[in-house]
């Protein structure tokens, strides 16, 4: 059972969709650019991305601080139950913008802005990222991270936008964890029905990479659930 708005939207967002992404950024002053493309099934909650560092490679910091900006930011691919309005799918064809602050436990800060649009039947993502204050001997600059644990983003409406909050955990090579508090504001470019509060359960994996992480492939599975749902499904 889908609403009229979501029915109309299914004509715009197909069962299978591609995307292109361009990121420009700097981390502790090191400037870089990344180009990528991806594909996935928006109504099933799965997507893959192939990404290439086109300027500034090899990167002198851990890829893991970039990976969520391509996937956790590719929100049209989140599976939603019929009774939760899919705010970000409904924003198309106009699309949406988002901005994010990631505060890491050692004082590192990453800010991200992203513009999502639809051109010729493909999603187009323009991303800007800035990372500062990462200690030179810390896990990011020493490349000691080993990917993100599965996480749950708490979504809620506020001031005409959709807010997301996550406590994210990076796995470390020594077996420990490195934590980040992540806050994102998503805003459609046109008036769209906002959902109530719910959770998006997310699992992001690096599926392949070359030795210096200048070519990386990622896979993500993401599903919206009422606030009581667990994360077991992500591991199936």
């Amino acid at each position: 059972m889908v609403s009229k708005g979501e029915e109309d939207n299914m004509a715009i967002i197909k069962e299978f969709m591609r995307f292109k992404v361009h990121m420009e950024g700097s981390v502790n002053g090191h400037e870089f650019e990344i180009e990528g493309e991806g594909e996935g099934r928006p109504y099933e909650g799965t997507q893959t991305a192939k990404l290439k560092v086109t300027k500034g490679g090899p990167l002198p910091f851990a890829w893991d601080i970039l990976s969520p900006q391509f996937m956790y930011g590719s929100k049209a691919y989140v599976k939603h139950p019929a009774d939760i309005p899919d705010y970000l799918k409904l924003s198309f064809p106009e699309g949406f913008k988002w901005e994010r602050v990631m505060n890491f436990e050692d004082g590192g800060v990453v800010t991200v802005t992203q513009d999502s649009s639809l051109q010729d039947g493909e999603f187009i993502y323009k991303v800007k990222l800035r990372g500062t204050n990462f200690p030179s001997d810390g896990p990011v600059m020493q490349k000691k991270t080993m990917g993100w644990e599965a996480s749950s983003e708490r979504m809620y409406p506020e001031d005409g936008a959709l807010k997301g909050e996550i406590k994210q955990r990076l796995k470390l090579k020594d077996g420990g964890h490195y934590d980040a508090e992540v806050k994102t504001t998503y805003k459609a470019k046109k008036p769209v029905q906002l959902p109530g509060a719910y959770n998006v359960n997310i699992k992001l994996d690096i599926t392949s990479h070359n030795e210096d992480y200048t070519i990386v492939e990622q896979y993500e599975r993401a599903e919206g659930r009422h606030s009581t749902g667990g994360m077991d499904e992500l591991y199936k």
């Epitope: 913008k97 988002w98 901005e99 800010t111 802005t113 800035r130 005409g160 504001t185 998503y186």
Partner: nanobody, 121 residues
Amino acid sequence: QVQLVESGGGLVQAGGSLRLSCVASGSAPSFFAMAWYRQSPGNERELVAALSSLGSTNYADSVKGRFTISMDNAKNTVYLQMNNVNAEDTAVYYCAAGDFHSCYARKSCDYWGQGTQVTVS
């Protein structure tokens, strides 16, 4: 180029309220932030509150629950509503603006006002 003009500062009793205003003129980037900072004698300039173009808010721990930042887009004005003020809130308050990356979570805003004095007695 963005110009910022603050107003609303003055003398206020402890426990009282005050509303600061900042009128902005000029063009803004697609992702921007407006912020209030403050500086008291002998101390560094510190973030009080920031508001982004998409509506994200960022408050200093010391003012959470007491101060509210808001924007009236039609008037190009950002406000700082200060409630339940105390002596530690005495400072020169600066309005600032800039790109989201420089001004929302960092102190490197592109544009600054001249400042308005707030004194709590």
